[in-house]
């Protein structure tokens, strides 16, 4: 066979699917890979073949389309599963060709198991509300064109293991589930469970979310340097060494990169000759505010690292923030006793 | 199915003390804010009090006639809420209910314990 | 605190015949997020209280369609399409905006 454009094998697109349940699975060729559509690749001639390599197996076969009420179908640019078996996890290709073309891409189908609380080795979306920000809602995911809209599903949702009826502050609306004012514990796994007529049967389509409730965008302030401040003054003899933490509280911003940074003499640490060394560590609360403190180390200082301006920096969507440490050399004590010794001896 | 179930009443003399438990099954407690609802023979409902999750900080509130002599209490380990009444006067004989949530209104409701405080 | 206020205190009603029960709050009950704090809830006798409407117009599961609730602000309405036999009790309006947490005093249905 002429040589066919082989775009491996797309990890990228881990797609994880609950066993006994419908899946369709759109060929990524057209998604990600090539610059046409299907309508497009059929219109010209081009052909649309599935196969597959089961679990633990190197054989590539052909999909077979004629199992009972057509369990695996295929519509368009779509493998459908009416519904998924455990053992039919594995890579699947899709490959476009016809006599002069041909391109093809493996994925990984994991066909995945759940227990009775929808409790699954799923990967889960995470989908953040704001802290009592107004009424926030979160869509049941992923059930486009699995049924007309002429069908009317019925959508129950949980969280964690029970129904959602009306609790505190969460009202389910059909494939809407609304949080009158998100609040800490609100945050979970949330499940919708859809289930629709098809030809004379009834599937269930499960989703499940994780919730996490995060800062309110209301409450947000530019970065806060809490050290270095005016209150410590960092006193060192040379020799000594000298650590200067810089704490700086973040209130949480979506999509906000938070930086922090020292300047030694207006320069970054790493553009200057002094033996520095810088370590980071960050915290979380509970509403994803974060905490970061980067220390400053100098092991032995010297009387003109003493003499430096050390500033730490730090920056988030919100805005810029500065602040001086207080660095200075200590004076050596009076050596009152050599000077009473002296005095004594003179009366 | 939710379910609460109130435990813990009697007949006490006036200045006496009781204490009433409401066990939750059916959902995750944790999460709940969770009432105490009292409804003296004959009258309305008066709330008693609340407590939220402790996620959502623990917070406690009480009706000014119980502030002081009742304590609200939870125990998310067991599924349980508490109501501590000291210092009881005739005027707290009612039946007492423990009730869910709050801002949606109470959604699940105890079949209720009577205290009567009578000397 | 807020006073909740409803009328009329009694209402005997005819089975089949509407119904109509009014709340008033000393306060506007509208949330800053735009819900009414506000719910209804029937005693039936003998019973735990059980809730019917919350946030002023949203029905509880598993309340029958004849029962709805309007209003916003300070003024509230319970309404019941065709009283049934069943819907004899003492019914409330609560508040929920803010602690302490308040009822109305009651409107006992009767079936005349």
């Known amino acids: 066979s002429e040589r066919c454009d082989d775009w491996g094998l797309d990890t990228m697109r881990q797609i994880q699917v609950f066993e006994d349940e419908p899946a369709r699975i759109k060929c990524p060729l057209f998604e990600h890979f090539l610059k046409f559509n299907y309508s497009t690749a059929h219109s010209a001639g081009l052909t649309l073949i599935w196969y597959w390599t089961r679990q633990d197996r190197d054989l590539e076969e052909p999909i077979n389309f004629r199992l009972p009420e057509n369990r695996i179908s295929k519509e368009k640019d779509v493998l459908w599963f009416r519904p998924t078996l455990l053992n039919d996890t594995g890579n699947y290709t899709c490959m476009l060709r016809n006599t002069t073309y041909c391109s093809k891409v493996a994925f990984p189908l994991e066909v995945v198991q759940k227990d009775s609380c929808f409790n699954s080795p799923m990967k889960l979306p995470v989908h953040k509300l704001y802290i009592e920000y107004g009424i926030q809602r979160i869509t049941c995911p992923n059930v486009d064109g699995y049924f007309p809209s002429s069908v009317k599903p019925t959508i129950t949702w949980y969280m964690g293991c029970y129904k959602i009826q009306n609790f505190n502050n969460v009202i389910p609306e059909g494939m809407n589930l609304s949080f009158l004012i998100a609040l800490i514990s609100n945050n979970g796994n949330y499940t919708c469970v859809v289930t629709y007529p098809e030809n004379g049967r009834t599937f269930h389509l499960t989703r499940t979310l994780t919730v996490k409730v995060v800062g309110s965008p209301k409450n947000a302030v530019p970065p806060v340097i809490h050290s270095p401040n005016d209150h410590v003054v960092y006193e060192k003899e040379p020799g000594e060494e000298l650590l200067i933490p810089c704490t700086v509280y973040f209130s949480f911003l979506m999509d906000s990169r938070n930086e922090v940074w020292w300047t030694i003499d207006g320069k970054k640490p790493d553009d200057i000759t002094i033996d520095v060394t810088i370590n980071e560590s960050i915290s979380h609360s509970r509403t994803e505010d974060e905490t970061r403190t980067q220390i400053l180390s100098i092991k032995k200082v010297t009387s003109e690292d003493l003499k430096r301006s050390y500033v730490c920096h730090a920056r988030s969507a919100k805005g810029e923030v500065a602040k001086a440490a207080k660095v200075k050399q200590k004076v050596p004590a009076p050596r009152y006793t050599v000077e009473l010794a002296c005095g004594f001896g003179a009366t | 199915e939710v379910q609460l179930v109130e435990s813990g009443g009697g007949l006490v003399k006036p200045g006496g003390s009781l204490r009433l438990a409401c066990a939750a099954t059916?959902?995750?407690?944790?999460?709940?804010?969770m009432s105490w609802v009292r409804q003296g023979s004959g009258k309305g409902l008066e709330w008693v009090g609340r407590?939220?999750?402790?996620?959502?900080?623990?917070?406690?509130d009480y009706a000014a006639p119980v502030k002081g002599r009742f304590t609200i209490s939870r125990d998310d380990s067991k599924n349980t809420l508490y109501l501590q009444m000291n210092s009881l006067k005739t005027e707290d004989t009612a039946m007492y209910y423990c009730?869910?949530?709050?801002?949606?209104?109470?959604?699940?409701w105890g079949q209720g314990t009577l205290v009567t405080v009578s000397s | 605190d807020i006073v909740m206020t409803q009328s009329p205190l009694s209402l005997p009603v005819t089975p089949g015949e509407p119904a109509s029960i009014s709340c008033r709050s000393g306060?506007?009950?509208?949330?800053?997020?735009?819900?009414?704090?506000l719910a209804w809830y029937l005693q039936k006798p003998g019973q735990s209280p059980q809730l019917l409407i919350y946030?002023?117009?949203n029905r509880a599961s598993g309340v029958p369609d004849r029962f709805s609730g309007s209003g916003s602000g300070t003024d509230f309405t319970l309404k019941i399409s065709r009283v049934e036999a069943e819907d004899v009790g003492v019914y409330y309006c609560?508040?929920?905006?803010?602690?302490?947490?308040?009822f109305g005093q009651g409107t006992r249905l009767e079936i005349k």
């Open positions: 009730t869910t949530g709050e801002l949606l209104g109470f959604d699940y």
């Open positions: 059916g959902f995750t407690f944790s999460n709940v804010w």
């Open positions: 407590i939220k999750s402790k996620a959502d900080g623990g917070t406690i």
């Open positions: 306060q506007s009950l509208l949330h800053s997020n735009g819900f009414n704090c």
């Open positions: 946030l002023g117009s």
């Open positions: 609560m508040q929920t905006l803010q602690t302490p947490i308040t």
